[in-house]
């Protein structure tokens, strides 16, 4: 969590932003809160980016201001118009890119002062795993699989009975290459797994973190995966 | 060359189904947002279905749970299978390609006719 | 539900008259996210005007976008005998996820 304050002591005012990660080929949110004000008129949000020469969007006066914005964020840029009157400048970007990772600025002028805060925006991609029982396999075996992943995470195995268990020499991962030469698809393979147990298949990379889980009994088999964003720190 | 040429539809029956390609040449399908667009005879323009470069997928109410939209990566090629298919589905169906820039590249179209 | 309405429905003028055409949308709309295209009798739409109002590559300067919040407009300086077709506003992020407008048709007077 990043607070900003403004430069002019009785003339400031408070801008927090999260730092936040955006997965590519995805829209993604730049968050970003002010103390309000209560005439939309007399707010100006803008966002910028280190490194950039123009800015990544304005909005002054109740509207956008694009006039300024810089070329590789047209099209692409959009505030909460209807949330801007409650303090929320938060940033939606169109179609998320590697290249927009980077420093942020929110920067915030009202009728009580000025005020910004900085944001650290990480780009990469990551989803949900799904652990599947592999009926070609000569041996029990489980295979778990993630379409889109970047950059190379690591994989790691682990089991409900064998807590603490290291899997890495009866488990193989490989990393394929995607279309569009950005991600990767993820498969994890597990061997000599035993029924009526529960494994975990956990990928991880500096943005995100997923798990899938599956248990294997002689009746049934239950599935489940969840995914946590490691980067959102709050200034 | 930068296009989209889409293939697939034809005369079916209500209830029927159909599965429209569109195949891409010039730029990758899985990193941009790629768009279906239907337009009914005399009509105009309609949204049914958008795939993000992640593979998240949306609908317009209106196909809701009747249509799947797809794509091959490695053939560059974009889908839409149409099941359950009502008269109220005749139309010519575009893909388009939405890139950071709007609706920027279309396909001819495809006609689709729902019809006994 | 965000709704687009076009006006006027149809515009009847003449060659090297100006053309100014409406799209209002029933809730805010970014002005980054609406989006003017040009459809005439049997073709695909192509895209004119995209962030409000930025033309796309390779349409002449006749054609302008201006707007934001829930009022755009398309402005045409002077008609020429090619830009007679129907013209359609679109807008991208809200719910449904893309929207146009019904269309407003550019007839020759």
């Known amino acids: 969590l990043i607070i900003g304050f403004g430069i002019s002591g009785r003339h400031s005012i408070t801008v927090t932003t999260v730092a936040s990660a955006g997965n590519i080929g995805e829209d993604g949110i730049l968050s970003c809160t002010f103390e309000p004000d209560i005439k939309l008129s007399d707010i100006v949000i803008q966002w910028l980016k280190e490194g950039v020469l123009g800015l990544v969007h304005e909005f002054k006066e109740g509207k956008d201001e694009l006039s300024e914005q810089d070329e590789m964020f047209r099209g692409r840029t959009a505030v909460f118009a209807d949330q801007v009157i409650v303090g929320n400048a938060s940033l939606r970007l169109k179609n998320v890119q590697l290249t927009d990772a980077g420093t942020y600025k929110c920067y915030i002028i009202t009728s009580k002062g000025k005020g910004n805060a900085n944001l650290e925006y990480k780009t990469g991609a990551f989803s949900m795993p799904e652990v599947n029982v592999d009926y070609n396999a000569s041996s029990e075996t489980l295979r778990c699989e993630a379409p889109r992943w970047f950059p190379q995470p690591t994989v790691v195995w682990a089991s409900q009975v064998d807590q603490g268990a290291n899997f890495s020499e009866v488990s193989n991962t490989s990393f394929e290459l995607n279309s569009e030469n950005v991600t990767m698809k993820v498969v994890s393979v597990l061997y000599n797994v035993t029924i009526n147990n529960t494994y975990s298949c956990m990928i991880e990379n500096d943005i995100a973190k997923a798990t899938g889980d599956i248990k294997v009994t002689e009746s049934e088999i239950k599935r489940r995966s969840h995914l946590q964003l490691l980067n959102s720190k709050a200034s | 060359e930068v296009q989209l040429v889409e293939s697939g539809g034809g005369l079916i029956q209500p209830g029927g189904s159909l599965r429209l390609s569109c195949a891409a040449s010039?730029?990758?399908?899985?990193?941009?947002?790629m768009n279906w667009v239907r337009q009914a005879p005399g009509k105009g323009l309609e949204w049914v279905s958008v795939?993000?470069?992640?593979?998240?997928?949306y609908y317009a109410d209106s196909v809701k749970g009747r249509f799947t939209i797809s794509r091959d990566n490695s053939k560059n090629t974009l889908y839409l299978q149409m099941n359950s298919l009502r008269a109220e589905d005749t139309a010519v169906y575009y893909c388009?390609?939405?890139?950071?820039?709007?609706?920027?590249?279309w396909g001819q179209g495809t006609t689709v006719t729902v019809s006994s | 539900e965000i709704v687009l309405t076009q006006s006027p429905g149809t515009l009847s003028l003449s060659p090297g008259e100006r053309a100014t055409l409406s799209c209002r949308a029933s809730?805010?709309?970014?002005?980054?996210?609406l989006a003017w295209y040009q459809q005439k009798p049997g073709q695909a739409p192509r895209l004119l005007i995209y962030?409000?109002?930025s033309r796309a590559t390779g349409i002449p300067d006749r054609f302008s976008g201006s707007g934001s919040g829930t009022d755009f407009t398309l402005t045409i300086s002077r008609l020429e005998p090619e830009d007679f077709a129907v013209y359609y506003c679109q807008q991208y992020g809200s719910s449904p996820l893309y929207t146009f407008g019904q269309g407003t048709k550019l007839e020759i007077k």
């Open positions: 388009a390609r939405d890139g950071d820039y709007g609706m920027d590249v």
């Open positions: 962030g409000a109002s």
């Open positions: 795939i993000y470069g992640s593979g998240r997928t």
């Open positions: 809730q805010s709309v970014s002005s980054s996210y």
């Open positions: 010039g730029f990758i399908v899985s990193r941009n947002y």
